[in-house]
């Protein structure tokens, strides 16, 4: 099943238009913005989701220290160029011919330049650090229960295999989820850690991308886990290239 046949919708992406015009009258869904056909049995790529979002009407100590090469998405939303597989193109440009290179999660990894800027390859983000702060609770969560529930969430909601959840760190009230996935580790059909992290980020913000599924109800031993702050760091297989001016 590419999509839910009964009412022809896309369970994994509500930013789609679906109709029974696939082979044999099967339900087929296309992403808003790009019009690309999407596989509704898995997560839609972040690039297509960002494109769809831009086309939609506007609404409003045990902890890991991110390395000096970690990127944070400070640029916010933009209308990306996606390749035929739905991945980010290595070079992105805006309407004023300002260009920059991005990694596989679409985060800028070079200084901005003009149309002459070259981005030879799409550099893979192989390590994502999701930094969360939860709202105060009666006591700290049990670390192993928290670890198990977060791995279960990524497995069952985002279909990310537990082997890609490298670690869950906890030092109340900070939770850090480390996702790791090298090019060599990612097999055909595996969900990309960048896509899983993006779905999780949108879920945490109360902006679920799933069709008809309830919002994220995270509980650890019945106790609600309510997140009040999220920060995501991205580490690429090749360190980013920024001028010293940006680093000071």
């Amino acid at each position: 099943h590419t999509a839910a046949q009964d009412n022809c919708t896309c369970p994994t992406n509500k930013m789609t238009v679906c109709s029974p015009d696939g082979p044999g009258g099967r339900c087929q869904c296309r992403a808003l913005g790009s019009g690309m056909a999407v596989d509704c049995s898995t997560l839609t790529s972040k690039c297509l989701l960002l494109k769809a979002r831009m086309s939609a009407p506007k609404n409003a100590r045990t902890l890991v220290r991110p390395s000096e090469h970690a990127l944070v998405d400070n640029d916010g939303l933009y209308d990306p160029d996606c390749d035929p597989e739905g991945r980010f193109k290595a070079r992105q440009c805006n309407q004023t011919s300002v260009c920059w290179c991005v990694n596989s999660v679409g985060v800028r990894r070079t200084d901005k330049g003009d149309l002459s800027l070259r981005c030879d390859e799409l550099v893979r983000t192989h390590h994502i650090l999701i930094d969360l702060r939860h709202r105060p609770t009666a006591g700290a969560f049990n670390h192993s229960d928290l670890d198990a529930e977060l791995r279960r969430l990524f497995r069952e909601r985002y279909r990310l295999h537990p082997k890609f959840v490298a670690a869950v760190h906890y030092e109340q009230p900070t939770i850090q989820i480390e996702l790791r996935q090298n090019t060599s580790q990612k097999a055909a059909g595996d969900v990309d850690i960048g896509d899983a992290a993006y779905y999780f980020e949108r879920d945490i913000k109360g902006e679920s991308l799933f069709q008809g599924r309830g919002g994220l109800d995270l509980r650890v031993r019945g106790e609600p886990l309510q997140v009040e702050r999220t920060l995501i760091y991205y580490l690429d297989e090749i360190p980013p290239k920024f001028s010293m001016k940006r680093l000071t």
Epitope: S41, S144, R151, R152, E156, P162, K163, V165
Partner: antibody, heavy 120, light 110 residues
Framework: QEQLKESGGGLVQPGGSLKLSCKAS????????VSWVRQAPGKGLEWIAY????????YYATWVNGRFTISSHNAQNTLYLQLNTLTAADTATYFC?????????????WGPGTLVTVSS | DVVMTQTASPVSAAVGGTVTIKCQAS??????LSWYQQKPGQPPKLLIY???KLASGVSSRFSGSGYGTEFTLTISGVECADAATYYC????????????FGGGSEVVVK
């Protein structure tokens, strides 16, 4: 050849305890999740617990209520199920079952089972 | 808690005929449904996963269909060796679950 083999079953008195083992061979234990499933004589399959050994993540059926504990010894490729406060209702064949290594919980490799009889 | 309900037993089938077993989930499990075959004195054997995909080494006489809450296992060209109990299982979640297996449906071949 990929195999699972349960052991440790037998006759136990009501209120007693027992520790079941499941030895895995022929595959990398850390790449899969494993469950314990039981079947009372003439009855259906009843899931007990699941563990992802690589990270020691454990999940239990709601009815377990702390009576049973799933664990693993990864270096020995062995899965365990500790059974406490046993009653006649726990009399069953206990199977260990491995998942397919995907994100689904479908079990494509099963052991032959070990029989636990709770009786005075 | 996802509860799985199966066709009542026993289900009779004639050799060469077709038999259908139904399974219902109390809430949507998308396509995350597996079917198992169990014969007396043996452990269960995985037949179908993700509602319609045939497990390795399983005869193509077995087929599965369904999505969401309604699922079906079909055995065509029934053989005497198909006499067994068949179980469906939701393969979506291990969280807050009483039992992911259905109650089982016994197939009797005449």
């Amino acid at each position: 050849q990929e195999q699972l083999k349960e052991s440790g079953g037998g006759l136990v008195q009501p209120g007693g305890s027992l520790k079941l083992s499941c030895k895995a061979s022929g595959f990398d234990f850390n790449k899969y999740g494993v469950s314990w499933v039981r079947q009372a004589p003439g009855k259906g399959l009843e899931w007990i617990a699941y563990i992802y050994p690589a990270f020691h993540n454990t999940y239990y059926a709601t009815w377990v209520n702390g009576r049973f504990t799933i664990s693993s010894h990864n270096a020995q490729n062995t899965l365990y199920l500790q059974l406490n406060t046993l009653t006649a209702a726990d009399t069953a064949t206990y199977f260990c079952a491995r998942d397919a290594g995907t994100t689904d919980y479908n079990f494509n490799l099963w052991g032959p089972g070990t029989l636990v009889t709770v009786s005075s | 808690d996802v509860v799985m309900t199966q066709t009542a037993s026993p289900v009779s089938a004639a050799v060469g005929g077709t038999v259908t077993i139904k399974c219902q989930a109390s809430q949507s499990i998308y396509s995350y449904l597996s079917w198992y075959q169990q014969k007396p004195g043996q452990p269960p054997k995985l037949l179908i996963y993700e509602a319609s995909k045939l497990a390795s080494g399983v005869s193509s006489r077995f087929s599965g269909s369904g999505y969401g809450t309604e699922f079906t296992l079909t055995i065509s060209g029934v053989e005497c060796a198909d006499a067994a109990t068949y179980y469906c299982q939701q393969a979506l979640t291990v969280g807050n679950v009483d039992n992911p297996f259905g109650g089982g449906s016994e197939v009797v071949v005449k």
